[in-house]
């Protein structure tokens, strides 16, 4: 999918309002400096690229973001402002269903998340650059 | 199964306010969006706007905005519709009708309407 | 805003006969359309979703086709509970939108 058309303002709003405020919930316990940022992102379509990835795309050591409260919110908030986002998404979240897994939070989830928190921060200075 | 019940028929003066119900059940509220729609006698679909309760948010159609309000209580699964400075082209059934916010993605169920009668 | 254009206004049909129901949008809404029947005094009811995906409980006479600009609503052969109006509606971006409804009456 190709964010270049989404309304990043929206998005922005969302985030700052509530999807943060999950992420910051699901990392609690854990110190900033506990893990390195090393994903990165350059500008606004390539960091909800990468948002989405890290969110919703499984890894072999950390299955079960997608089902956590900022990935739903995640996923809300590009389908709302993201023009056909929604269509790519019908299939995709019949294969989520299907593979559905025991809610663990493991070390390796909590270092994706940390990596999450840094991208969408970098989406943000991309965005008060622009402005 | 997916239920959503509207307020009854209102009959206002214009320059008056209503606010429409539509009270959900069957489903988990927060997975949903709620959307209005509003039929004026003899004539088609208008979308008026979204509340999105899981992300707080809400969007409008241009020709409504500052006269419409959406909101939501979570506590009891309802819904609700603010249409302020009202004149006589408001008369219209208004329609709520839930659409997936991560799923789904379409409106599948509706409710039954409520009529808006604005008249002097 | 995107604009959803349908055709005919009015389609005049026999019970038995196939319908073809045209919406056009302004611009390429790739597959986010959907199509609903509305009887009089009732909410509308969703047939299709997405273009062509079809609705459980919804007869398989009902089908929809089409991408981009172009879609189509196609039944197979009219029932007597099908003479209703029906609507497009696009879900590709904020605000959505409705085409003005065609109606399918008898002929």
């Known amino acids: 999918y190709d964010f270049t058309n989404c309304d990043f303002q929206k998005i922005e709003a969302d985030y700052l309002r509530t999807i943060s405020k999950d992420l910051i919930t699901y990392m609690s316990g854990t110190k900033s400096t506990d893990f390195n940022n090393t994903v990165s992102c350059s500008n606004r379509p390539h960091c909800l690229t990468e948002i989405q990835s890290l969110t919703f795309n499984p890894t072999p050591r950390c299955a079960s973001l997608a089902k956590e409260m900022f990935a739903r919110k995640t996923k809300a908030t590009l389908a709302l402002w993201c023009p056909g986002y929604s269509e790519t998404q019908i299939n995709a979240t019949q294969a989520m269903k299907k593979r559905r897994k025991r809610k663990v939070t493991t070390n390796k989830c909590l270092e994706q998340v940390s990596q999450l928190l840094g991208l969408w921060r970098r989406f943000i200075r991309t965005l008060l650059k622009k402005q | 199964q997916v239920q959503l019940v509207q307020s009854g028929a209102e009959v206002k003066k214009p320059g008056a306010s209503v606010k429409v119900s539509c009270k959900a059940s069957g489903y988990i509220f927060t997975d949903y969006a709620m959307h209005w729609v509003r039929q004026a006698p003899g004539q088609g679909l208008e979308w008026m706007g979204t509340?999105?309760?899981?992300?707080?948010?809400?969007d409008y159609n241009q020709n409504f905005k500052g006269r419409v309000t959406m909101t939501t209580d979570t506590s009891t699964s309802t819904a609700y519709m603010e249409l302020r400075s009202l004149r006589s082209d408001d008369t219209a059934v208004y329609y709520c009708?839930?659409?997936?916010?991560?799923?789904?993605?379409?409106?599948?169920?509706w409710g039954q309407g409520t009529l808006v009668t604005v008249s002097s | 805003e995107i604009v959803l254009t349908q055709s005919p206004g009015t389609l005049s049909l026999s019970p038995g006969e196939r319908a073809t129901l045209s919406c056009r949008a302004s611009q390429p809404i790739s597959i986010s359309v959907h199509w609903y029947q509305q009887k009089p005094g009732q909410a509308p009811r969703l047939l299709i979703y997405f273009a062509s995906q079809s609705i459980s409980g919804i007869p398989d006479r009902f089908s929809g086709s089409g991408s981009g600009t172009d879609f189509t609503l196609t039944i197979s052969r009219l029932e007597p509970e099908d003479f209703a109006v029906y609507y497009c509606q696009q879900t590709f971006s904020l605000p959505y939108t409705f085409g003005q409804g065609t109606k399918v009456e008898i002929k």
């Open positions: 509340f999105i309760p899981l992300l707080d948010t809400s």
């Open positions: 009708a839930r659409m997936g916010v991560t799923h789904s993605y379409v409106m599948d169920a």
